[in-house]
């Protein structure tokens, strides 16, 4: 006859308040004849949880019919779980004895703990935008989970990050825990469309981690590059000067033209285009009237991007004598 083994497969059972917990116990032999009882805790102070033969256990039901002769499954269900139910539960085989049954073998025990899912991670980026090549910090927070063991990972566009620090509080025993992690991310010029992801894995999530995201578009400022060019062709007595503002983010931009230091109020034509990487290009055309112009016309394109200090680019207008003659001819 095979030696009796008491099998309690789960070392830890996480349960939620109000739900039903199933505590598993099977035996490998029916012998010696005698009952299987459930206790919480060990030693003389242990609490009887279920005895098939006697007692009233309104919240406990058996998974199998224990009256069946060859039953080897002594698993039980405990309904309406409360925090008071936490502890380690043991199924214990007794052999029949007199005047009372004698404990024969105990299962290894299943610890019942209250499990609580972590809240959805919230990722917060820096308060102010930063330019590429600089490092920014993102924080990720999740709360209300139990037990304390939890795994947090950071990703940028699917690539795992390593530069982060994580804390789980409190350090001692608690009903629920919180996690806070700060990751340091170096910004790249193409990060307008990038995302950082904080991924939290916990035993209560059954292998389906929670994710919080933040868009680097909220954290990055890509400063523009400026180029001012004079179009070789002219329209009548006007020369078209173009200011190209390239690769900037965010879209917030103010552009002004100055002619020999004087801000020009008149409207200019412009176009805004979005690049594949999420940055923008702005092209502004300024028509300069070249009749009666002196040779020393200096045009300035000034750009104020996202509230930063203005940057500008100058162009000394090249107006040939031939152009002047033509324009003079055209003037009545």
């Amino acid at each position: 006859e095979e030696e009796l083994q008491m099998i309690q497969p789960e070392k830890l059972l996480l349960v939620t308040v109000g739900k039903t917990a199933t505590l598993h116990c099977t035996v490998t032999s029916l012998l010696p004849v005698g009952p299987v009882l459930w206790f919480r805790g060990v030693g003389p102070g242990r609490e009887l949880i279920y005895n098939q033969k006697e007692g009233h256990f309104p919240r406990v039901t058996t998974v199998s019919d224990l009256t069946k002769r060859n039953n080897m499954d002594f698993s039980i269900r405990i309904s309406s779980i409360t925090p008071a139910d936490v502890g380690t539960y043991y199924c214990v085989k007794f052999r029949k004895g007199s005047p009372e049954n004698v404990e024969f073998k105990s299962g290894p025990g299943t610890e019942m703990a209250l499990g609580a899912k972590p809240s959805a991670p919230v990722v917060l980026g820096p308060a102010a935008r930063t330019t590429p090549e600089h490092t920014v910090s993102f924080t990720c927070e999740s709360h209300g989970f139990s037990p304390r063991d939890i795994t947090l990972k950071w990703f940028k566009n699917g690539n795992e990050l390593s530069d982060f620090q994580t804390n789980v509080d409190p350090t001692g025993q608690s009903v629920a825990y919180s996690i806070r992690s700060t990751a340091r991310v170096v910004l790249d010029p193409w990060d307008v469309r990038s995302q950082v992801i904080c991924e939290v894995a916990h035993v209560t999530l059954q292998g389906d981690p929670l994710r919080g995201t933040a868009n680097l578009s909220e954290a990055i400022r890509v400063p523009p590059t400026l180029e001012v060019t004079q179009q070789p062709m002219r329209v009548g007595n006007q020369v078209n000067v173009t200011c190209q503002v390239r690769k900037f983010y965010p879209q917030s931009l103010q552009l002004t033209w100055s002619e020999n230091g004087n801000v020009c109020q008149r409207e200019t034509a412009s176009t805004l285009t979005e690049n594949k990487d999420g940055t923008y290009n702005w092209t502004s055309w300024f028509l300069v009237n070249i009749s009666d112009q002196r040779d020393d016309v200096v045009l300035t394109c000034q750009v104020k991007h996202d509230g930063q200090l203005a940057v500008s680019k100058r162009l000394a207008l090249e107006v040939t004598v031939h152009q002047k003659d033509q324009s003079s001819d055209a003037t009545p």
Epitope: L30, P35, Q52, L66, T67, R69, N71
Partner: antibody, heavy 120, light 107 residues
Framework: QVQLVQSGAEVKKPGASVKVSCKAS????????IVWVRQAPGQGLEWMGW????????NYAQKLQGRVTMTTDTSTSTAYMELRSLRSDDTAVYYC?????????????WGRGTLVTVSS | DIQMTQSPSSVSASVGDRVTITCRAS??????LAWYQQKPGKAPKLLIY???NLQSGVPSRFSGSGSGTDFTLTISSLQPEDFATYYC?????????FGGGTKVEIK
């Protein structure tokens, strides 16, 4: 073959003792308890006592306390019931049975019985 | 001690009849009741254990029910080999006690 084989019929004088044997085969002897039940002629069943084949603990019917002794020999898978100071009303068929319930007591395997006659 | 009272003490019936035997415990015994069949000159045979579980090899025409103090053994369609004496037995606690028996006779 799972069975309980009892010793043969006995005729005893009042005041004598009788020892009935019950040999188990075909199952793990120490895994079960053994009960002894007797039945006087034309009467019902009377439980005499129980013995754990695993550890030898016993529980006897109150009316037989002091006169009955139940033992087991695990090396031979045999249970014994000795009844002393026999009286005429001890005349009965004595059965051994295997006790099979887990939380309770019921008897799924019986010996054929041993007739003990107490007569002067 | 727990007293077991069986009724009737005897019943006359014909083959094919439905026969019901009752057993009452003097105190609650949950479901810890067994039923046995005994034929003259033979050892008892276990029919039902834990009030309603059919012992292996026993025909399905035998059934048991009840809990607490009142229990019933039913033979749904009496067969010739069923004429015998039937005993209930409480297995809840020592001392184990039997009912007085019900003799099922041929009408």
């Amino acid at each position: 073959q799972v069975q309980l084989v009892q010793s043969g019929a006995e005729v005893k004088k009042p005041g004598a003792s009788v020892k009935v044997s019950c040999k188990a085969s075909g199952y793990t002897f120490t895994g079960y308890g053994i009960v002894w039940v007797r039945q006087a002629p034309g009467q019902g069943l009377e439980w005499m006592g129980w013995i754990s084949a695993y550890a030898g603990e016993t529980n006897y019917a109150q009316k037989l306390q002091g006169r009955v002794t139940m033992t087991t020999d695990t090396s031979t898978s045999t249970a014994y019931m000795e009844l002393r100071s026999l009286r005429s009303d001890d005349t009965a068929v004595y059965y051994c049975a295997r006790e099979a319930g887990s939380s309770w007591y019921d008897f799924d395997l019986w010996g054929r019985g041993t007739l003990v006659t107490v007569s002067s | 001690d727990i007293q077991m009272t069986q009724s009737p003490s005897s019943v006359s019936a014909s083959v094919g009849d439905r026969v019901t035997i009752t057993c009452r415990a003097s105190q609650g015994i949950s479901s810890w009741l067994a039923w046995y069949q005994q034929k003259p000159g033979k050892a008892p045979k276990l029919l039902i254990y834990a009030a309603s579980n059919l012992q292996s090899g026993v025909p399905s025409r035998f059934s048991g029910s009840g809990s607490g103090t009142d229990f019933t053994l039913t033979i749904s369609s009496l067969q010739p080999e069923d004429f015998a004496t039937y005993y209930c037995q409480q297995g809840a606690s020592f001392p184990i006690t039997f009912g007085g028996g019900t003799k099922v006779e041929i009408k």
